[in-house]
């Protein structure tokens, strides 16, 4: 038998993916484990094999269909179980009644691009990926800019409290290399969390014109 504390956390990307992480102190690395999804009002079940991500945690993605298909709604409840093989039997290691739209984590924003850049400012746009139409405009964003000589953790967070898929960065230094990231979060859901940060977008401000006051 496996003893120790267990944590089973899952998030729905709002379309067709439930990502799960299971942590178990004292679990055996060699054990084969599955996450099993049993919706209360759907005709499908889904499993994914948990793969090790560290010494005591495993992860997998329940892929429910094509990436942009709407597979669950606000009224769905999905029973999620972790089952691990013990000899010829399967033992339930963790279980939760999962409400998808209370546990949202969207995909990172994509297609970041510089729309316009000047000496002191830069206009950047992006797109959201695989986000449910149910949200309409009820999304918020956080953005951060990496300046030379600083770390991402030191970068101040810019908050956009509406569905605005662009930003105008100001008070930038001329002829300077920057990086930019953005993340998204629905307003809905008690346990909803921020998406991962987008891939960084590198850009450079224009040099100040010689002989001109900048």
């Amino acid at each position: 038998a496996v003893n120790g504390t267990s944590q089973f956390t899952c998030f729905y990307n709002s379309r067709a993916n439930i990502s799960c992480v299971w942590s178990q102190d004292g679990a055996l690395q060699d054990t084969s484990c599955q996450v099993h999804a049993w919706p209360d009002r759907r005709r499908w079940n889904q499993t994914c094999e948990l793969l090790p991500v560290s010494q005591a945690s495993w992860a997998c993605n329940l892929i429910l269909g094509a990436p942009d298909s709407q597979k669950l709604t606000t009224v769905d409840i999905v029973t999620l179980r972790v089952l691990c093989r013990e000899g010829v039997r399967w033992r339930v290691m963790a279980i939760q009644d999962f409400k998808p739209f209370e546990n949202l984590r969207l995909m990172a924003p994509i297609s970041l691009q510089v729309v316009h850049v000047e000496t002191h400012r830069c206009n950047i746009s992006w797109e959201i990926s695989q986000a449910s139409h149910y949200f309409e405009r009820h999304l918020e964003f956080e953005a951060r800019t990496l300046s030379p000589g600083h770390t991402w953790e030191e970068a101040p967070l810019l908050t956009l409290k509406q569905k605005q898929e662009w930003i105008c960065l100001e008070t930038l230094t001329p002829d300077t290399q920057y990086e930019f990231q953005v993340r998204v979060k629905p307003l809905q859901g008690e346990f909803t969390t921020w998406s991962p940060w987008s891939q960084p977008l590198a850009f450079r401000t224009k040099p100040a014109a010689l002989g001109k006051d900048t």
Epitope: S32, Q34, H36, W44, N45, Q46, T47, C48, E49, L51, C60, I63, L64, G65, A66, P67, L83, W90
Partner: nanobody
């Protein structure tokens, strides 16, 4: 709806080898646990091997352990059955099966099926 197409079956001598392939289309391949079954003339369809969605874990019926290897290539939407040291009792139509639920795939009922490929092992 998911479609499965098997290939690679033929007449082979006892002790020989074959590799069966099954190409899956019509849905996201990595959703599916994949399995091979076989049906000999006048017998029930029987489970042969299964491979999980990630490809990390495989299981086999006792009579083929050590001789058959199931694998999958998620980039090619294909599952394989490598059959070595074939015996006359391996003669059957081999079927590829898909199910989104690992725990249901052996029960036959709710699987998606290919049309089968004939394997004949002569002594």
């Amino acid at each position: 709806q998911v479609q499965l197409v098997e290939s690679g079956g033929r007449l082979v001598q006892a002790g020989g080898s074959l590799r069966l392939s099954c190409v899956v289309s019509g849905d996201v391949f990595v959703r599916y646990t994949m399995a091979w079954f076989r049906q000999a003339p006048g017998k029930e369809r029987e489970f042969v091997a299964v491979v999980t969605d990630s490809g990390r874990t495989t299981e086999y019926v006792g009579s083929v352990k050590g001789r058959f290897t199931v694998s999958r290539d998620n980039a090619k939407n294909t599952v394989y059955l490598q059959m070595n040291n074939l015996k006359p009792e391996d003669t059957a139509v081999y079927y590829c099966a898909a199910n989104t639920d690992y725990f249901q795939i052996r029960s036959v009922d709710n699987n998606a099926w290919g049309q089968g490929t004939q394997v004949t092992v002569s002594s």
